[in-house]
Structures are given as C-alpha cells and as structure tokens.
C-alpha cells in the first residue's frame, strides 16, 4: 500500500540552466494524503540552508500531486545556487534533495559585437 508520509519529489543532483532577466518557477512537487503540509524554500550557503523569507511563492494543485512554487520574476545573477524545499509534517521536518540553478547573465554571456567589430568582420553579415 502507498505510504502516507509526505514526499518531496525533487531529483537528487537536479540542475536548471536559466537566463538572468527571464521569469522562472522553481517547483517542489509535494505528495501528501490528508492535510497539506507547511512547505518552505531555502537557499544553501555552505552547509546551512537559509530560509527564503519575503519571496513570492504559490501552490499549484494537480490530481495526484501539489506543487509549491518559488517565483523568480525576473531571475537575477545572484539567484545562482542550490535550493531545497522542506515540509513540516506531524512535527517532523522532511527535506528535499537540493536542486541547483545555473544562471547565465545574458549581458556578459552574449555581448553583442560593437559596430566597429561588425565592420571589421563583414562575413558576420551573411
């Protein structure tokens, strides 16, 4: 029979490559049986996970699972790092695996060539 423990479905060593400036939703899939647990997000700083206060979060309910979502609107370069969600269930703290966001800063990653550079490289126009 299926366990009635709360389970957090974040894959171990999961990663997301995202762009600074874009919106992004980081999902924590939560399986529970009766009462929805209290869920929070934290960001890893070394070995400690710092709770994310004052961040926009929301719930999305689906048939067999619920998603606790951390919103990035927009993604900032310093959002780079590892995140974990945790659920309080019957006085127990259940922690997910951590998931890592790799943020590409579009400005530094894909600086457009200047007009001078374009002029010196006419083959780029074709």
């Amino acid at each position: 029979k299926e366990s009635c423990d709360v389970q957090l479905y974040i894959k171990r060593q999961s990663e997301h490559s995202i762009l600074a400036g874009d919106p992004f939703e980081l999902e924590c899939p939560v399986k529970y049986c009766a009462n929805r647990p209290h869920v929070t997000w934290c960001k890893l700083n070394g070995t400690t996970c710092v709770k994310l206060e004052d961040r926009q979060t929301s719930w999305k309910e689906e048939k067999n699972i619920s998603f606790f979502i951390l919103h990035f609107e927009p993604v900032l370069p310093n959002d780079n790092g590892s995140y974990r969600c945790s659920a309080n269930f019957q006085s127990n703290l259940i922690e997910s695996h951590s998931t890592t966001l790799y943020v590409t800063d579009v400005k530094s990653a894909s600086e457009r060539p200047s007009k001078d550079e374009m002029a010196s490289r006419p083959w780029l126009l074709y």
């Epitope: 894959k11 999961s14 990663e15």
Partner: antibody, heavy 119, light 112 residues
Amino acid sequence: EVQLVQSGAEVKKPGESLKISCKTSGFNIKDTYIHWVRQMPGKGLEWIGRNDPANGNTKYSPSFQGQVTISADKSISTAYLQLSSLKASDTAMYYCASYEGYYERFGYWGQGTLVTVSS
Amino acid sequence: DIQMTQSPSSLSASVGDRVTITCRSSQSLLDRDGKSYLNWLQQKPGKAPKRLIYLVSKLDSGVPSRFSGSGSGTDFTLTISSLQPEDFATYYCWQDTHFPYTFGQGTKLEIK
C-alpha cells in the same frame, strides 16, 4: 511491465555517425535519469553520461565529452545516444539505464546495442 | 575522478560457499544528504547488467536475500551468503555520488 528497449545492432564505417534509441515503458521517464554506459569487448563498464528527461539537463563524463550527445524526448518516452565521427575503438556494446531520480527506488537496464565500426 | 577498486578481480568458489567482494573508493561516497550512493550490479555473459543493491545495502525487489551489501565512507562489501549456480557472473560496484560516475573494474565469480 517495465521495459527499456534499445535499437538494433549497427555496423558503421569510420567517420560516420550513429544515433541509438532507448524506448522506455512502464514508468514515467520524467521521474528518472537516463544513463548511458559503454562496454568494450571483453572489458568492464564505463559511464558515458546521463540525461534528465524532465528538463533536458545532461552531464557527461570528461572521457566522452565532445564525442557523444545524449538527449531524450519525454513525449515519446525515448532517450538517445548520438555517436559522431566513429572510430574502430568505438566498437562496443552501449547500454541505457533508467534510475529513479528521487529515492533511487528502481534501476532498470536496456538490453544493449552492439555497435561495430569497421572499414 | 573517483577510482573504484574491486578485489579480488576474479574468484573461484563452490555452490554453498560464502563469498565476499570488496570495493574501495578513492574518496568518500557520502553525499551531503548523509547517504552513500553505491550500487552493486550483476552481469552474466552476453546479458545486460542488473542492479542488485543500491544505497550500499538496499536490495532491489526480486533479489534473493542471500545477497547483502554493507560499508560506509570508502569501503564497501557485497556478500553472497550461500552461492547458488545462477550466481556465477561478474559483479561491479558503481558510485553515483560524484561526477563523473565511475564503476569498479569488475569481479568475475567462477565455479571451482
């Protein structure tokens, strides 16, 4: 019934490319990581890399980086291994394996695809 | 890369024997969640590998209880308590704690 069914044996010439498929069924591919493993004739197992079908994120072993491309199409529950610029030394059995990503509760292997590279 | 060293490389034993295969990693396999991601696989000639044990000591469903795994940190053991004819095969340890994931070189278990 859980199955990982790989595409059939291939014979290729040096310099050619090849894409091997691994069709999964009996579980949700998005809940897993798909690994690819090489076994040269009479030798041990070598990890090539893995793909997260849920978001496309891929990790490669440095030994294979640039030589192979791993991908998946979650809509048809199929993973792929592409081998480019084939050499005789790429002759081997290639296996896909699907490991549950959350709690490692299952680890299934495909039957293998034998690739022979010969001029 | 983490080196996985299995010993012995080959082993002759008889049906009913107790057999132990060891696997040593060049660094700890303890992940930050406190678990060691160490698998044992069995491969028979001409067949695909099959996972027997994961997370050091958890048996896959359908795997006979004569197989057991133990260990921590860098030293791990696969034990077969009473060898059966179908157990003669090659056994591999595989770590999936640290990238790139790595296998041991294999231990070939043969009939004496």
